[in-house]
Interface confidence: medium
């Protein structure tokens, strides 16, 4: 159906509240430096305009595209040149180039300080005083820090945030109620951001085909009773939704996501037996519930894979006449039978199967050539299984902090040119895989670990792309999406690295270290560890363990001293000298 006014269409479909929230998110993701008040004003003006167009579709400018309307609005911002430099040049361009230009200026690492919550009483007063403004500020702060956040999901988290405050601001001990709930929500939000960034990178760097393959594998595992036609339909729609959100088309994205949820609920009999309770919820919760829904049980009568993909004499005909459909069917059939495999592994197996057919279908006797193809998957399956087993054993031995340090050492040696903050951030996140996945049953470990690692390594790739410093990181990031993790795992110590000059300033600590929260204290110590390794890349694990032990004792001692600052300035240089001597 063609609409006279696109903006009126989206306003009517989404409703005023969601429309305004999405516009605020869109502007905050584009102009990450602008103050909240400016964005509120812009969002209000666009929402008023949309409302007018909904009342009279043939009104002035109502027929303009959303990109034109949004871009024109962004280009009215007075401080564009001062705050964003060459982003202001985007305004000289015409659509669609102007929007592409804005997208290219999104900053994955804007460097804003971490959000620090004020006192619970002050928070509750602000919440009760103006709930809409309070939640708008939440949307703004998350969106500007995470310019690729999945917008409809952010609206859902804002709703959760509202629920937390509605409950905890009535509680006797507000702080005790808010603390754990806000922290749990924060963890979910950070993971959600990283997952969507991975999806956007898949689409932007590797194209629709890569994203569709990933989605076919994931959804086939989750909905093994659905047939391939049904999975394909959902994957096609889901691809459109994520392409729109990754491309900054948040209104279309949220609208299409709601349509997809509606479709899944209307067709749940042919998708999954687990959708029932999701489908009784309102739209935001419904979509979220469907995205997180538990896996359906496998059908009991699945025939052997070999019948269709190895023993059938028509395999090469099937493959050559419609490669993507045939490989998609293979991926679907393999994934629904193997919920315990990671999506990355399933995609590697499909790639291996494809390579085998490419080779064998060109020979005189294809069936003999591909007869053992399924057996050849074994090493591909063993590799992540062994990796997870080894690393979970290490995690259980060292605990999360110790495991993070082991990974810090490992990754600094692989890519010492990468900036210290990036190495610390990525290694800390990689280390969380232990906490997240190693406690799970054997049947869920690999899927949990490898797919989480893919998301975290994508963060490394995104940050590294902004300032490329290591050819090997560029190579692992750009050659193959599904082989990124094995590529990084396979990197050895970079022997070409020239050690960094020693800088005493890097190893100078002050009394403010003592008052930092535990996580920030860890970051300081881990920063020192990376810098130490960059200075002495040949240091052994034993030597590093000794130095880090000494460092921990030094911090503990000085933080317990009467004159903390005096202790740091006196004992610090001694520690550094001892460390240098120990690492000769």
């Amino acid at each position: 159906e063609a609409y006279k006014s696109e903006i009126a269409h989206r306003y009517n479909d989404l409703g005023e509240e969601h429309f305004r929230g999405l516009v605020l998110v869109a502007f905050s993701q584009y102009l990450q430096q602008c103050p909240f008040e400016d964005h509120v004003k812009l969002a209000k003006e666009v929402t008023e305009f949309a409302k007018a167009c909904a009342a009279e579709e043939s009104g002035a400018n109502c027929d303009k595209s959303l990109h034109t309307l949004f871009g024109d609005k962004l280009c009215t911002v007075a401080s564009l040149r001062d705050k964003y430099g060459d982003m202001a040049d985007c305004c000289e361009k015409q659509e669609p180039d102007r929007n592409e230009c804005f997208l290219a200026h999104k900053d994955d690492n804007p460097g804003f300080p971490p959000l620090v919550a004020p006192e619970p009483d002050a928070l509750c007063a602000a919440f009760q005083d103006n709930e809409q403004l309070f939640l708008g500020k939440y949307l703004y702060e998350i969106a500007r820090r995470h310019p690729y956040f999945y917008a409809p999901e952010l609206l859902y988290y804002a709703q959760q945030y509202k629920g937390v405050f509605a409950e905890c601001c009535q509680a006797a001990d507000k702080a005790a109620c808010l603390g754990p709930k806000i922290e749990a929500l924060r963890e979910k939000v950070l993971l959600s951001s990283a997952k969507e960034r991975f999806k956007c990178a898949s689409l932007q760097k590797f194209g629709d085909r890569a994203f569709k393959a990933w989605s076919v594998a994931r959804l086939s595992q989750r909905f093994p009773k659905a047939d391939f036609a049904e999975i394909s339909k959902v994957v096609t729609d889901l691809t459109k939704v994520h392409k729109e959100c990754c491309h900054g088309d948040l209104l279309e994205c949220a609208d299409d996501r709601a349509d997809l949820a509606k479709y899944m609920c209307e067709n749940q009999d042919s998708i999954s037996t687990k959708l029932k309770e999701c489908c009784d919820k309102p739209v935001l919760e419904k979509s979220q519930c469907l995205a997180e829904v538990e896996r359906d049980e496998l059908p009991g009568d699945l025939p052997s894979l070999a019948a269709d993909f190895v023993e059938d004499k028509e395999v090469c005909k099937n493959y050559q006449e419609a490669k993507d459909v045939f490989l998609g069917t293979f991926l679907y059939e393999y994934a629904r039978r193997h919920p315990e495999y990671s999506v990355s592994l399933l995609l590697r197996l499909a790639k291996e199967y494809e390579a085998t057919l490419e080779k064998c279908c060109a020979t005189d006797d294809p069936p003999t050539c591909y007869a053992k193809v399924l057996d050849e998957f074994k090493p591909l399956v063993d590799e992540p299984q062994n990796l997870v087993k080894t690393n979970c054993e290490l995690f259980e031995k060292l605990g999360e902090y110790g495991f993070q340090n082991a990974l810090l050492v490992r990754y600094t040696k692989k890519a010492p040119q990468v900036s210290t903050p990036t190495l610390v951030e990525v290694s800390r996140k990689l280390g969380k895989v232990g906490t997240k996945c190693c406690k799970k049953p054997e049947s869920e470990r690999m899927s949990c670990a490898e797919d989480f690692l893919s998301v975290v390594l994508n963060r490394l790739c995104v940050l590294h792309e902004k300032t490329p410093v290591s050819e090997r990181v560029t190579k692992c990031c750009s050659e193959s999406l599904v082989n990124r993790r094995p590529c990084f795992s396979g990197l050895e110590v970079d022997e070409t690295y020239v050690p960094k000059e020693f800088n005493a300033e890097t190893f100078t600590f002050h009394a403010d270290l003592c008052t930092l929260p535990e996580a920030e204290k860890q970051v300081k110590k881990q920063t020192a560890l990376v810098e130490l390794l960059k200075h002495k890349p040949k240091a052994t694990d034993e030597q590093l363990k000794t130095v880090m032990g000494d460092f921990g004792a030094f911090v503990e001692k000085c933080c317990a001293a009467e004159n903390k600052e005096g202790c740091f300035s006196e004992e610090g240089p001694k520690l550094v000298a001892a460390a240098q001597a120990a690492l000769v």
């Epitope: 047939d227 391939f228 036609a229 009568d301 025939p303 059938d312 419609a322 069917t329």
Partner: nanobody, 126 residues
């Protein structure tokens, strides 16, 4: 669930023609791999022709190649088998089978088809 209903069988002289139909309900026929099989008295079910779902890749048994044509009409949700130059050895009950979830792959193995019609008898005799 897929329900299938065959029709169009009958008595025909050698060299004659017949067109069998298989109407499907419960699933779109273009999303499903479908095939015609036949079963002569005292014999097993034998593959005759098949067509993949989503993409029209057709398959024929060697014994019917050049004489039989499989096709489908998605708007009518119906599968057809056009049989020309019929021979006495083509006499059998003809069944259509469907494999949802395998859109491309038409197997020649009857056991891999979960859904079947009740069959229509074709007799070729003078």
């Amino acid at each position: 669930e897929v329900q299938l209903l065959e029709s169009g069988g009958g008595l025909v002289q050698p060299g004659g023609s017949l067109r069998l139909s298989c109407a499907a309900s419960g699933r779109y026929i273009d999303e499903t791999a479908v095939a015609w099989f036949r079963q002569a008295p005292g014999k097993g079910r034998e593959f005759v022709a098949g067509i993949g779902g989503g993409v029209d890749i057709t398959y024929y048994a060697d014994s019917v190649k050049g004489r039989f044509t499989i096709s489908r009409d998605n708007s009518k949700n119906t599968l057809y088998l056009q049989m020309n130059s019929l021979r006495p050895e083509d006499t059998a009950v003809y069944y259509c089978g469907a494999r949802p979830g395998r859109p491309l792959i038409t197997s020649k193995v009857a056991d891999l088809y979960p859904y079947w019609g009740q069959g229509t008898l074709v007799t070729v005799s003078s």
